[in-house]
Interface confidence: low
């Protein structure tokens, strides 16, 4: 099964050869190249020097070699960086090559979403409802879930909005929101909303946003 | 069988630019890198750079890069050098060279072109 | 840039002499070293490729040695035919430079 490796965008994913070297060969006699799952080439470094025929325009400049982990860097992560990873080591004869080592990875690329935001996009109406939307932008993958967490001094109420989300066409990041309509007929207390975005490893949470009710006025003395 | 046909001599004046072709044929265009070799009158060979047809990656010689652009044509298998801002001493036989396969270990330019002559006169 | 330094520049030998050209890189380059042979008015031909092995249908009498810095062309016995100009090439890094060419003539 290939490595899995997880690394973040627009940072660097160490793709590792995990070459034992028990012939302790210099690299002076190697070909090593990592290729990704289309078969092109990101990398090659023929008998200690790293050579760019090969190398795919996508990758050109993007790429350093660690001759002491026998670690491939890619900079400059982007989610279609995402897949399988070959590195290929072949010891170099006149005649042609001889492969001795293969090494797979996996590559996820993560990106963290900003922390959601609530904006108010009516005013209270007679305290009777709100409509607020939550958003997050900049993330991968989707998130599993966006949801409204409503607290007064005496309840917590979740609301499960429709999750809305667009995608990045270039950087393929996500941007998510849900839009709410909250209603708090018998509310006479002050209320804090939250929002909350779910990934698979992280849950978010926004900054609190509070709603400050106006108390309900006492009747006016009633003088017989 | 593997060939490179390369465009006609050429005649130019110093400062115009020239654009010799080299067309393959008898191997896949694209699985193979195109070198560019000159040789002036009476000279030795100097290599001005490679295109890769498949990734259309280039790699000029420093002392052409700014003159030099090397192009290709995958509907036609065919390769361009185009020398701009010519000047006298770029008079030359252009060779274009086809490179063996990268993963059997061969960098050698194993098939060339017939070369073309460029002539640089005001 | 690797240089790469041949001599002689020009040789005279006859028909059925053993003759050894040789070229000097200034730096290490393995073995990444390539002869060819250029006859006038025609594009060079590969001889030998990876310092010391024939390309194929060069004849036998042909040789080439050396690694590293120093590098051998032999021609183990003259032939008509062999009278040209030679040059070796390397190509471990760009930009790939060749020697300046050594010139084979009849004596």
């Known amino acids: 099964a290939p490595l899995k490796i997880q690394a973040y965008f627009n940072e660097t994913a160490d793709l590792p050869c995990q070459f034992a070297n028990s012939q302790n060969q210099s690299l002076s006699e190697l070909v090593v190249f990592w290729q990704d799952q289309e078969n092109l080439v990101l990398n090659e470094v023929y008998l200690g020097k790293e050579k760019f025929d090969s190398v795919h325009s996508k990758y050109m400049g993007r790429t350093s070699f660690d001759s002491d982990s026998w670690t491939l860097r890619l900079h400059n992560l982007q989610i279609k960086d995402k897949g399988l990873y070959q590195c290929i080591i072949h010891h170099k004869k006149p005649t042609g090559m001889i492969r001795i080592h293969q090494m797979n990875s996996e590559l996820s690329v993560l990106a963290n979403f900003s922390q959601p935001e609530i904006v108010p996009i009516s005013n209270i109406t007679e305290n009777v409802y709100i409509n607020l939307t939550c958003s997050s932008i900049h993330g991968y993958p989707e998130p599993k879930k966006m949801s409204v967490l409503l607290r007064t001094k005496n309840s917590t109420i979740e609301y499960d909005g429709v999750m809305q989300k667009s995608q990045d066409n270039v950087t393929e990041l996500y941007d998510v929101s849900i839009s709410l309509s909250v209603s708090f007929p018998d509310v006479t207390s002050n209320m804090t909303i939250f929002c909350i975005l779910e990934t698979d490893k992280t849950r978010l949470l926004s900054s609190p946003f509070s709603i400050e009710l106006e108390d309900p006025q006492p009747p006016p003395d009633h003088i017989p | 069988q593997v060939q490179l046909v390369q465009s006609g001599a050429e005649v130019k004046k110093p400062g115009a630019s020239v654009k010799v072709s080299c067309k393959a044929s008898g191997y896949t265009f694209t699985s193979y890198v195109i070198h560019w070799v000159r040789q002036a009158p009476g000279q030795g060979l100097e290599w001005m750079g490679y295109?890769?047809?498949?990734?259309?990656?280039?790699k000029y010689n420093e002392k052409f890069q700014g003159r030099v652009t090397m192009t290709r044509d995958t509907s036609t298998s065919t390769v361009y050098m185009e020398l701009s801002s010519l000047r006298s001493e770029d008079t030359a036989v252009y060779y274009c060279?086809?490179?063996?396969?990268?993963?059997?270990?061969?960098?050698?330019?194993?098939?060339w072109g017939q070369g073309t002559l460029v002539t640089v006169s005001s | 840039d690797i240089q790469m330094t041949q001599s002689p520049s020009s040789l005279s030998a006859s028909v059925g002499d053993r003759v050894t050209i040789t070229c000097r890189a200034s730096?290490?380059?393995?073995?990444?070293v390539v002869w060819y042979q250029q006859k006038p008015g025609k594009a060079p031909k590969l001889l030998i490729y990876s310092a010391s092995y024939r390309y194929s249908g060069v004849p036998s009498r042909f040789s080439g040695s050396g690694s590293g810095t120093d590098f051998t062309l032999t021609i183990s016995s003259l032939q008509p035919e062999d009278f040209a100009t030679y040059y070796c090439q390397q190509h471990y890094s760009t930009p790939y430079t060749f020697g300046q060419g050594t010139k084979l003539e009849i004596k």
């Open positions: 295109i890769n047809p498949y990734h259309d990656v280039t």
């Open positions: 730096q290490d380059v393995s073995t990444e």
């Open positions: 060279a086809r490179q063996g396969d990268p993963y059997s270990g061969n960098y050698q330019f194993t098939y």
